[in-house]
């Protein structure tokens, strides 16, 4: 038979009471029933009491009395009584409800949002409710769009309902903004604020925040966190599909994070306890917002027990090169759960050995590789809780590009010069891993290039490989190799001995291994000039004579040879170029520049310098010669000739020493006849001495010497007496 509706003690659809009063409401029905109450009433424990009793004829009816002490404005709402366990089809007929207004002059609105506006999501064209319901149906409420617009209810598009608020039947973008419900009670203005947001269906991003694929041990708990990011005005529905969905294995928790001022973040967390093999497979998080849809999935693997397998990724012996920015030493590891990883180098923890060693997953990263990084590397893998341990060792060889020791230590900016004809020893000491081989090459200088560096004009010429029997360039005495320990390292020293230095060129030693090649150029310039630079003065001239200077430089080391005169003017040394220079003469090993100044005067005295530019350093080198031109002076005799007697057949010397500038020329006379050198009569150095061998009677007479130069002459005479008898008759 049809149940009669439950009956409420207060009749009608609504009832008004004052705040602070007690609400008594009885429900009488033909079956057991329950109350449905406003949210704020349901939360009351102290004020609310519900008592059940049997009532009516013969106690056959069910009664329930609701008592709400000191009712408050926010208890306003629907109070309904409905039968328990009634088929769905009859639900409408088995419920009685009344809307109770709990009037409070100090609180016209049931929900007050004065400090922080309530956010209402709207969709254009749909109904929008501004839920500023009131505590009394008699309150007049105005709806404003802040600050200047009033939205006036017209009974059609905008309707006022004191139980719901303002109902806007088809909202437009014009309703987006700060909407305020205003009510004036007893001269007081009350406001409750709402922010309307246009609802969109944009899903920015969906992610499962767990590594992919997910790996778990059987019996453990699976937690998958799905995150959907949307604009502030979007709402989403999030669902999961998973292997054992039919048994509802999973529990799902949802939450929303609205703390971000630019986006909403929705979370859906799926949890399955005690994972079994049937739970392995694809887990999909589906996110829907209106017509928009996005999904993301992840694979879940279940393992029965912990395991580790480790293999060499390539071979057991690995090679790298010193100087590499970064080298990754890695092993092929399969393991679950993730093992603890420790790398050892030669038995000691690698990362403790050097800050250049970094562990990344199952790899060891070596930063800025050096040859000290060579050694045995062991990966230790451990899953301690399951007592599973594995290790594997690899050997790392660090190859080093050859380096030539002499190249590093040489501080000479320009090449050495080798004396012509000398024996020379050239050495190259190389280091590298593997041990480099050293080869020698000869590169001749092109003699046409007198103005250029030999090693600059080498492009087109060939280099010749050398051995001890080579006949290219200079004669080679030997080429030998030996090991030498330098700075604690085994280095290969190769020595080339040049037997006879004759030809200028470049000796090149090349050190090679599989990493690379390095070369050292030894400029081998022959010099026939001491130190490669020499200035020569023929003789210091006197006024009126010629000044003759020559400058010889090594042609491979110097260029731009010129003579200059240095003069000091106001404490500053001035360089004057000399116009009287001849062309430089280029020879096999050197360049000579002669300077001749004819008929010099005293003013030609000064510091003469030969200037040349070092081809290698660009530096200008000067070699100076101080020249003092002497004043002319008439000859004068240091001692006059004096008469003397000499024994026949003996010898005699007559001295005529004269000074003067230029040095006087001495002329001898006997009895006014000029004496010429002939057998038995010898004129000494500069004719200053007259030496007569085996004096005869004919040699007796007046001897006369005359010293002459441009300034004049001086004379002296003496009588030579020959004493004794001639042997001539005897000889005849």
């Amino acid at each position: 038979s049809k149940l009669k509706d439950p009956e409420l003690s207060l009749k009608g659809t609504q009832h008004i009471m004052q705040a602070g009063q007690t609400l008594h409401l009885q429900c009488r029905g033909e079956a057991a029933h329950k109350w449905s109450l406003p949210e704020m009433v349901s939360k009351e424990s102290e004020r609310l009491s519900i008592t059940k009793s049997a009532c009516g004829r013969n106690g056959k009816q069910f009664c329930s009395t609701l008592t709400l002490n000191t009712a408050q404005a926010n208890h306003t709402g629907f109070y309904s009584c409905k039968y328990l366990a009634v088929p769905t089809s009859k639900k409408k007929e088995t419920e009685s409800a009344i809307y109770i207004f709990i009037s409070d002059t100090g609180r016209p609105f049931v929900e007050m949002y004065s400090e922080i506006p309530e956010i209402i999501h709207m969709t254009e064209g749909r109904e929008l409710v501004i839920p500023c319901r009131v505590t009394s149906p008699n309150i007049t409420v105005t709806l404003k769009k802040f600050p200047l617009d009033t939205l006036i209810p017209d009974g059609k598009r905008i309707i006022w309902d004191s139980r719901k608020g303002f109902i806007i039947s088809n909202a437009t973008y014009k309703e987006i903004g700060l909407l305020t419900c205003e009510a004036t009670v007893n001269g007081h203005l009350y406001k409750t604020n709402y922010l309307t947001h246009r609802q969109t269906n944009t899903i920015i991003d969906v992610q499962i925040s767990t590594p992919r694929p997910v790996k778990l041990l059987r019996g453990h708990t699976l937690v998958l966190n799905c995150t959907a990011t949307t604009p502030l005005n979007t709402r989403v529905q999030m669902t999961w599909s998973y292997p054992d969905e039919k048994n509802k294995r999973a529990s799902v928790r949802r939450r929303i994070d609205q703390s971000n001022s630019h986006a909403n973040i929705f979370y859906s967390v799926l949890t399955i306890d005690k994972m079994q093999n049937k739970d392995k497979g694809l887990y999909t998080c589906r996110v829907r917002s209106g017509p928009s849809f996005k999904s993301v999935n992840t694979s879940v693997h279940i393992y029965d027990k912990a395991f580790i397998t480790v293999k060499h990724r390539k071979q057991q012996v690995l090679e790298t090169v010193a100087g590499k920015r970064s080298y990754r030493l890695s092993m092929k590891v399969k393991a679950f759960p993730s093992p603890e990883v420790v790398w050892l180098k030669d038995g000691l923890p690698a990362t403790e050995k050097s800050a250049r060693y970094l562990t990344r997953g199952y790899s060891l990263i070596i930063k800025d590789v050096t040859e000290e990084d060579a050694g045995n590397y062991t990966i230790l893998l451990s899953i301690k809780q399951s007592n599973v341990f594995k290790n594997l060792t690899a050997t790392l060889i660090v190859n080093v590009k050859p380096q030539i020791y002499e190249k590093a230590v040489s501080s000479f900016p320009d090449p050495a010069l080798y004396p012509l004809g000398s024996r020379q020893i050239l050495t190259c000491t190389a280091y590298g891993i593997p041990q480099p081989t050293i080869k020698w090459f000869w590169h001749p200088c092109n003699h046409n290039h007198s103005e250029a560096r030999c090693d600059f004009c080498s492009n087109n010429e060939e280099s010749f490989i050398l051995d001890a029997d080579s006949n290219m360039g200079n004669r080679i005495e030997s080429i030998t190799q030996r090991m030498a320990i330098i700075e604690g390292k085994n280095k290969m020293a190769s020595t080339l001995v040049v037997a006879d230095s004759r030809i200028s060129g470049i000796y090149i030693c090349i050190a090679s291994n599989k990493v690379g090649t390095v070369g050292r150029n030894i400029s081998f310039y022959i010099t026939d000039v001491p130190n490669g630079f020499h200035v020569n003065l023929e003789k210091m001239p006197t006024e009126g004579e010629d000044l003759k200077l020559s400058c010889t430089v090594n042609k491979f080391l110097y260029r731009d040879v010129t003579w200059i005169l240095l003069r000091t003017v106001n404490n500053r040394t001035m360089h004057y170029s000399i116009s009287k220079q001849k062309m430089a003469i280029t020879k096999e090993h050197s360049i000579t520049l002669n300077l001749t100044i004819m008929n010099v005067s005293l003013q030609d005295s000064g510091t003469y310098a030969c200037r040349a530019r070092n081809v290698y350093t660009g530096e200008e080198i000067l070699q100076k010669k101080e020249i003092t031109i002497r004043d002319q002076e008439a000859p004068y005799l240091l001692r006059n000739l004096s008469d003397h007697t000499v024994a026949i057949s003996s010898s005699t010397t007559l001295d005529c020493h004269a000074n003067g500038v230029p040095e006087p020329q001495i002329t001898w006379f006997k009895n006014n006849h000029k004496i010429q050198q002939e057998p038995g009569i010898i004129l000494g150095p500069g004719s200053s001495t007259l030496f007569i061998e085996r004096v005869t009677e004919e040699d007796e007479g007046v001897y006369h010497c005359k010293a002459t130069n441009q300034k004049g002459s001086v004379e002296s005479s003496a009588y030579l007496t020959v004493q004794g008898t001639s042997d001539k008759s005897n000889l005849e």
Partner: antibody, heavy 119, light 110 residues
Framework: EVQLLESGGGSVQPGGSLRLSCTAS????????MNWVRQAPGKGLDWVSS?????????YHVDSVKGRFTISRDNSKNTLYLQMNSLRAEDTAIYYC???????????WGQGTTVTVSS | QSVLTQPPSASGTPGQRVTISCSGS????????VNWYQQIPGTAPKLLIY???QRPSGVPDRFSGSKSGTSASLAISGLQSDDEADYYC???????????FGGGTKLTVL
Amino acid sequence: EVQLLESGGGSVQPGGSLRLSCTASGFNFEDYGMNWVRQAPGKGLDWVSSINRQGDISTYHVDSVKGRFTISRDNSKNTLYLQMNSLRAEDTAIYYCTKNHDYHGMDVWGQGTTVTVSS
Amino acid sequence: QSVLTQPPSASGTPGQRVTISCSGSRSNIGNNFVNWYQQIPGTAPKLLIYLNSQRPSGVPDRFSGSKSGTSASLAISGLQSDDEADYYCASWDDSLNGWVFGGGTKLTVL
């Protein structure tokens, strides 16, 4: 780009009149309430007038300008106006045209136009 | 005399936190929301905070606003030299039916 451009400022004698204009661009002019705010030399900001979206019901003025100033708008021209009559020396200021934010406050300001009232 | 009351000046050193207060009455701050504006000398004001505490996009999170009863305050943390400006609070006033502003606070970064 949302922009407000004021014009019509200038010098006028006390008792004179001026009409300020503000041309809006970069947004749907008719959907927003608009305001005039002024700033006397070396002083703070003072609200002058406001007008609602449609420009029919709600116009508001500060007491000191009531009966002298009138705010109006022409939505078809995207222009806001301030008709200023019976000007006084104390009306000397930079006048800013401002747009109401969707939710609260004035989110866009013009660069201002200067009004000088002196004899 | 401004309807809302602000201190005429405030100062702080770079990196410091500075707070500017604004007090009003029930008809303005008490019953309405507060906005804050920044005005760099020679330029138009700029909206800094709306709805008591919301920042428009582009305003750094160093700026924060709050309201309690009939008072509001603006806090600037990690003070920078380019924060030197005049700061104004504003609210709607139900009695005057219009906007009211504070007198402005000149912030100096020492």
